[in-house]
Interface confidence: low
């Protein structure tokens, strides 16, 4: 997978009036990294590991960027004509990437209320509208505005583009992301599910990073796809990932399953609880 | 009008204390780092300590860590430096320094600690 | 710790010179370097922040620029007030360090 960093800003106004403020968010590597803490208008890092990544480094680069980047973003809501009454949200979303061929992307991807109206791929300088009439009006409305801003040139958004990479560059400097290695914990549950039947549920969570091969076997063999069902690699909100697979077998024949896993070039084979015990519960190393 | 005022400086012997104030006004003081910087005598700018807004995390510079400790009480708009061991070479004007938020475009007056016997 | 070296120590100039201090950091610090003047018994004055932006109020004579390890502050005609001593500081990380200083004076 690429090394990513995700903007994520939000301005608001009300009865056509932009608010003060702003709400923002950076995701680093797909987990919730910083985020802006409007009462103390700084940067913050979202828990210890995403601390860890900047060390004893101060984050005034990153209060200095979300500061003026929510700025910039409440003067384009300023211009946008069809504010009505009540309360109405812009958001924009910055992403760059690094690919392990070390190639990059960065796209910006602006909603109004919640709605996509315009996508910029800042490589090809490519911009993208949805069909709807309303996502056609607002893009123009914001195109013209970036267009009359002199500051909002080509150069411009590839200054942004070479910025967002030069700090998700800073960032993977950091031996916490780049060797940040935190093994799964593996839970084997059991439970009830028709005559004769039981589901056999796998989960793997606190882990890190992201990829992870979570199957079930049937003497040493892995099932195939369709005989088992999958939940989403998700951010547990803690820096690390969960995941499950569950599977449904015949009552009695316990002892013939177990959970595999694969984590960061480890693995480990976990059996299923036989009768009455309902969780196993293991943390490997 | 945006201030800082250091207090507390004094004549004080090796490895006696001494405590440091600074008061603040003009700005939302809750909101920002603020800095200990000296200057010795004829001498360069060394940063001495530095206190989160919220005082959560503090950091200091080697030459004092162990002895001295930064403090702050955000709800009378005031830093603290209490210095403890004192050694002839802590002599220098002590400033207190803030801004946005680590560059330091706030700085107080400075206050003059003497560390003789 | 993050080491700064100036360049010049010293040095003499005229008014309307142009005049350029620099700065070494011993590791990369991006652009988080701020550069103050200091007349003798006055308090430190910010001049730049963010290795190239001008602190409000400071004539446009100012210049910073540069990134990662070297850094530059120029005037581009001194004036006699501009007759002082320049550090650099960098806080890109803890403990905060400045440069040595660079003592500017009149020829």
């Known amino acids: 997978e690429p090394h990513s960093l995700r903007y994520n800003l939000t301005v608001l106004s009300w009865d056509g009036s932009v608010q003060s403020g702003f709400l923002a968010e950076v995701h680093l590597d797909g987990q919730p990294f910083l985020r802006y803490d409007r009462q103390k208008c700084r940067a913050k890092p979202q828990g210890q590991w995403a601390e860890d990544v900047l060390g004893n480094k101060t984050w005034d680069r990153e209060t200095r960027d979300l500061t003026g980047n929510g700025k910039d973003l409440r003067m384009t809501l300023a211009h946008i004509k069809d504010q009505k009454e009540g309360l109405h949200s812009l958001q924009e979303i910055r992403v760059c990437e690094i690919h392990e061929d070390n190639s990059t992307r960065s796209s910006q991807h602006f909603y109004y209320d919640g709605e996509l109206f315009l996508s910029q791929n800042v490589e090809t300088e490519e911009w993208t509208v949805p069909q709807s009439s309303r996502a056609q009006t607002l893009a123009m409305n914001v195109r013209n505005f970036l267009k009359e801003d002199a500051m909002k040139t080509k150069t411009h958004y590839h200054a942004m583009h070479a910025d967002c990479l030069q700090e998700l560059r800073r960032y993977l400097e950091s031996s916490v992301v780049l060797r940040r290695r935190v093994p799964p914990m593996v839970n084997v549950t059991r439970s009830e599910a028709s005559e004769g039947n039981i589901t056999v549920t796998c989960r793997a969570s606190s882990f890190y990073p992201r990829n992870i091969t979570l199957s079930t076997r049937q003497d040493g063999v892995s099932l195939s796809h369709d005989t088992q069902q999958w939940g989403d690699v998700l951010p547990d909100g803690n820096g690390t990932y969960q995941t499950w697979v569950a599977t449904r077998i015949c009552q009695g024949e316990e002892q013939r399953f177990t959970c595999y896993m694969e984590h960061s070039g480890n693995h480990s084979t976990h059996p299923v609880p036989s009768g009455k015990v309902l969780v196993l519960q293991s943390h490997w190393q | 009008q945006v201030q800082l005022v250091e207090s507390g400086g004094d004549v004080v012997q090796p490895g006696r204390s001494l405590r440091l104030s600074c008061a603040a006004s003009?700005?939302?003081?809750?909101?920002?780092?603020i800095h200990w910087v000296r200057q010795a005598p004829g001498k360069g700018l060394e940063w001495v300590a530095v206190?989160?807004?919220?005082?959560?995390?503090?950091y200091y510079a080697d030459s004092v860590k162990g002895r001295f400790i930064i403090s702050r009480d955000n709800s009378k708009n005031t830093l603290y430096l209490q210095m403890n061991s004192l050694r002839a070479e802590d002599t220098a004007v002590y400033y207190c320094?803030?801004?946005?938020?680590?560059?330091?475009?706030?700085w107080g007056q400075g206050t003059m600690v003497t560390v003789s016997s | 710790a993050i080491q700064l070296t100036q360049s010049p120590s010293s040095l003499s100039a005229s008014v309307g010179d142009r005049v350029t201090i620099t700065c070494r950091a011993s590791?990369?610090?991006?652009?988080?370097l701020a550069w103050y003047q200091q007349k003798p018994g006055k308090v430190p004055k910010s001049l730049i922040y963010?290795?190239?932006s001008l602190e409000s109020g400071v004539p446009s004579r100012f210049s910073g620029s540069g990134s990662g390890t070297d850094f530059t502050l120029t005037i581009s005609s001194l004036q006699p007030e501009d007759f002082a001593t320049y550090y650099c500081?960098?806080?890109?990380?803890?403990?905060?360090?400045f440069g040595q200083g660079t003592r500017l004076e009149i020829k």
């Open positions: 320094a803030s801004g946005p938020p680590d560059a330091f475009n706030i």
């Open positions: 003009g700005f939302t003081f809750s909101n920002y780092n």
């Open positions: 206190i989160r807004y919220d005082g959560i995390n503090k």
């Open positions: 590791q990369g610090i991006s652009s988080a």
């Open positions: 963010d290795a190239s």
């Open positions: 500081q960098q806080f890109n990380s803890y403990p905060i360090t």
